[in-house]
Amino acid sequence: FERTRSLQDPCSNCPAGTFCDNNRNQICSPCPPNSFSSAGGQRTCDICRQCKGVFRTRKECSSTSNAECDCTPGFHCLGAGCSMCEQDCKQGQELTKKGCKDCCFGTFNDQKRGICRPWTNCSLDGKSVLVNGTKERDVVCGPSPADLSPGASSVTPPAPAREPGHSPQ
């Protein structure tokens, strides 16, 4: 089949990094600068992506592969192939349409990207709060008070005055 195909279509012999040039009797011509072909048999070369401005070049474009970009410090990649760069926020914040905003009480974000997530509700697992949550950190759940038989652990259960998961601001 391959031999038949190449007899019928001279372009199928053009390797990656070249294109089948209709203007020159369908001979294989190298991709011009700033372009590439990642597969054989192509009739045109694709334009190389330019990693400019907020984008930085992670891998240069070659005649057979497109450039790959990442983001300048203070920004992180979003989308397939780092199609966009989104602003970093501090831990304890999330990015909104109005910019970086602190996590609401009862939520946290331990990364420079993404959204604030609710603190774990320890009581749902029958556990108690060992370490209170903050804007930057989730609560740490510990054994339930019932599991703490006298002398079985050195952990002091938290004062029961507060609702699980809450911490003073």
């Epitope: 011009p32 700033n34 334009i47 992506r49 330019q50 400019k52 401005g53 907020v54 920004f75």
Partner: antibody, heavy 118, light 110 residues
Framework: QVQLQESGPGLVKPSETLSLTCTVS????????WSWIRQPPGKGLEWIGY???????NYNPSLKSRVTISVDTSKNQFSLKLSSVTAADTAVYYC????????????WGQGTTVTVSS | QSVLTQPPSASGTPGQRVTISCSGS????????VNWYQQFPGTAPKLLIY???QRPSGVPDRFSGSKSGTSASLAISGLQSEDEADYYC???????????FGGGTKLTVL
């Protein structure tokens, strides 16, 4: 189809601040660079600066000390402020959408004329 | 003084082929792609050629672009009276981390 519309005062006094807004309609502001370009009467095009939708900015070094470009994604707008203006800042001001992967200005506003005069 | 250098004027008769040159340096044309814009009097510029030789939809194939080294050129074949306009080359400049323009070429159809 994405359209851009510049708005702001057509007359600014010397030493004051020129303020223009570009409203993006028919598409999202996300994923692109947004530039301000100006053209003095009878002259060529001059890039003022750009802002990426997520806030990254860069300005023409010759204007950098006087320029601020900001973006409001919730309103689909971006803005230009040029301080301490002189008669040399009299020009038609264009806002543009710039493709972020191949960098070309594929959408232009109609332009707004700003005259600096007392 | 523009970063990219274009001839201030060019002319041709209907049906002729004219070319407009654009010269730069290693930090702009030499390492990046070139775009061309067409501007009629009193109107905003319009993208004519991008990435050296690509035409946006709606642009006639009479317009073509090319690049070699630190220079680029715009060719218009089968010149028509409606092609009379100003033409600007532009491209990214790595030292500026932003775009630069040529001074523009006024094309007259005689």
């Amino acid at each position: 189809q994405v359209q851009l519309q510049e708005s702001g005062p057509g007359l600014v006094k010397p030493s004051e601040t020129l303020s223009l807004t570009c409203t993006v309609s028919g598409g999202s502001i996300s994923g692109y660079y947004w530039s301000w370009i100006r053209q003095p009467p009878g002259k060529g095009l001059e890039w003022i600066g750009y802002i990426y939708y997520s806030g990254f900015t860069n300005y023409n070094p010759s204007l950098k000390s006087r320029v601020t470009i900001s973006v409001d994604t919730s309103k689909n707008q971006f803005s230009l402020k040029l301080s301490s203006v002189t008669a040399a800042d009299t020009a038609v001001y264009y806002c543009t959408r710039d493709h972020s992967h191949y960098y070309y200005m594929d959408v232009w506003g109609q332009g707004t004329t700003v005259t600096v005069s007392s | 003084q523009s970063v990219l250098t274009q001839p201030p004027s060019a002319s041709g008769t209907p049906g002729q082929r004219v070319t407009i040159s654009c010269s730069g340096s290693s930090s702009n044309i030499g390492s990046n792609t070139v775009n061309w814009y067409q501007q009629f009097p009193g109107t905003a510029p319009k993208l004519l050629i991008y990435s050296n030789n690509q035409r946006p939809s709606g642009v006639p194939d009479r317009f073509s672009g090319s690049k070699s080294g630190t220079s680029a050129s715009l060719a218009i074949s089968g010149l028509q009276s409606e092609d009379e306009a100003d033409y600007y080359c532009a491209g990214w400049d790595d030292s500026l981390n932003g775009p630069v323009f040529g001074g523009g070429t006024k094309l007259t159809v005689l």
